[in-house]
Interface confidence: low
């Protein structure tokens, strides 16, 4: 888990490498200055947005190399005894709301799968990402509005849930994931979600300022 010092360091995205480089550059230029993190993040984000694909390429290569490193290290990593694959999730807890992109995916994934039955999960996710990126800001609004409403509802629900107090995980005895017929389906769904989240993360990096301006 988080406490295991032997666990491989998580893989870094191209944007994370870019931010790291920005930080290092800033430190060199201003070794004694304290960093206003939100201001710094905003500047990084603005710079990232105006960078060409060629300029981003360097950081994408770094991310690919780091992903390979992470996968290599994870192959030989043995988690400490008693650590389970899935962390306990209270089934009664409110579900995290979907993002605008996730709602878009829910609508368009069946269409893509229908049109291209042979596409892999990864290719479907890639295509959804391309389609989302190619959808005008105004057309994203219905999804963004719906996502905002669901987020609002989730925040209310989670506040109420927390006020009640979380149930004790140990009493529930549901730490281990069920090894049922459903497991394979769940894993496939998770792969789908992970693909979408990766696309979403890229989207967030690219899109985080659009809301302010539109």
């Amino acid at each position: 888990g988080k406490g295991d010092p032997k666990k491989p360091r998580g893989k870094m995205s191209s944007y994370a490498f870019f931010v790291q480089t920005c930080r290092e550059e800033h430190k060199k230029k201003h070794p004694d200055a304290s960093v206003n993190f939100s201001e710094f993040s905003k500047k990084c984000s603005e710079r990232w947005k105006t960078m060409s694909a060629k300029e981003k390429g360097k950081f994408e290569d770094m991310a690919k190399a780091d992903k390979a490193r992470y996968e290599r290290e994870m192959k030989t990593y043995i988690p400490p005894k008693g650590e389970t694959k899935k962390k306990f999730k209270d089934p009664n807890a409110p579900k995290r709301p979907p993002s605008a992109f996730f709602l878009f995916c829910s609508e368009y994934r069946p269409k893509i799968k229908g049109e291209h039955p042979g596409l892999s999960i990864g290719d479907v996710a890639k295509k959804l990402g391309e389609m989302w990126n190619n959808t005008a800001a105004d057309d994203k609004q219905p999804y963004e509005k719906k996502a905002a409403k669901l987020k609002e509802k989730y925040e209310k629900d989670i506040a109420a849930y927390r006020a009640k107090g979380k149930p004790d995980a140990a009493k529930k005895g549901v730490v281990k994931a069920e090894k049922s017929k459903k497991k394979k389906e769940e894993e496939e769904d998770e792969e789908d979600e992970e693909d979408e989240e990766e696309e979403e993360d890229e989207e967030d990096e690219e899109e985080e300022e659009d809301d302010d301006d539109e």
């Epitope: 603005e46 947005k49 105006t50 694909a53 368009y108 269409k111 049109e115 295509k127 391309e130 389609m131 990126n133 190619n134 959808t135 005008a136 800001a137 105004d138 057309d139 300022e209 659009d210 302010d212 301006d213 539109e214």
Partner: antibody, heavy 120, light 107 residues
């Protein structure tokens, strides 16, 4: 190589109809938003209409709303513009363009245009 | 709708001179959502700059773009004979609007 080829332009009387086509090649058509942009003789560029990759979303400039319909056939890699109730002020060269987000959300792939003349 | 106003309408300069073309948005436009195009008579427009300041592939470095508030500027540092054309700015913030164009002509 990305290629866009417009066709269907010509001379039409006011109130008449015309259907423009834009044949796309050299890229995965179904992944990209497409647009129609026009240019009246000696005038500037005017965005006419937009369609999302799946065809699920469309939008139009106020000047053509209710008269023009954009559509696409992803199986044929073709974009269309159905123009009804044509007016003299619709006379222009009509360009189809690919909205290429990879180049920064702008369209740098254009056809050479097809001329539409509305005159009696 | 967002209006894009370009100035001047016509700019008369000689080869080797510096050209400064301006484009003002009627409301706030994310700098990422502004492009500049060049168009020559009888040809389709050609993308020069996107994201207000990033040169498109194959565009020489004499072309540069900058932004200050709602004002966007295209600068051509040293005019070449091939640069005399009409230039358009275009926003994508809420759909797509072009400026009316600036004609750059030889003095």
């Amino acid at each position: 190589e990305v290629q866009l080829l417009e066709s269907g332009g010509g001379l039409v009387q006011p109130g008449g109809s015309l259907r423009l086509s834009c044949a796309a090649s050299g890229f995965t058509f179904s992944w990209y938003s497409m647009l129609w942009v026009r240019q009246a003789p000696g005038k500037g560029l005017e965005w006419v209409s937009y369609i999302s990759p799946s065809g699920g979303f469309t939008n139009y400039a106020d000047s053509v709303k209710g008269r023009f319909t954009i559509s696409r056939d992803n199986s044929k890699n073709t974009l269309y513009l159905q123009m009804n109730s044509l007016r003299a002020e619709d006379t222009a060269v009509y360009y189809c363009a690919r909205w290429d987000y990879n180049s920064g959300w702008y369209y740098d792939h254009w056809g050479q245009g097809t001329l539409v003349t509305v005159s009696s | 709708d967002i209006q894009m106003t370009q100035s001047p309408d016509t700019l008369s300069l000689s080869p080797g001179e510096r050209a400064t073309l301006s484009c003002r948005a009627s409301q706030s436009v994310n700098s990422r959502n502004l492009a500049w195009y060049q168009q020559k008579p009888g040809q389709a427009p050609r993308l020069l700059i996107y994201g207000a300041s990033t040169r498109a592939t194959g565009i020489p470095d004499r072309f540069s773009g900058s932004v200050s508030g709602t004002e966007f500027t295209l600068t051509i540092s040293s005019l070449q004979p091939d640069d005399f054309a009409t230039y358009y700015c275009q926003q994508y913030n809420s759909y797509f609007t072009f400026g009316q164009g600036t004609k750059l002509e030889i003095k």
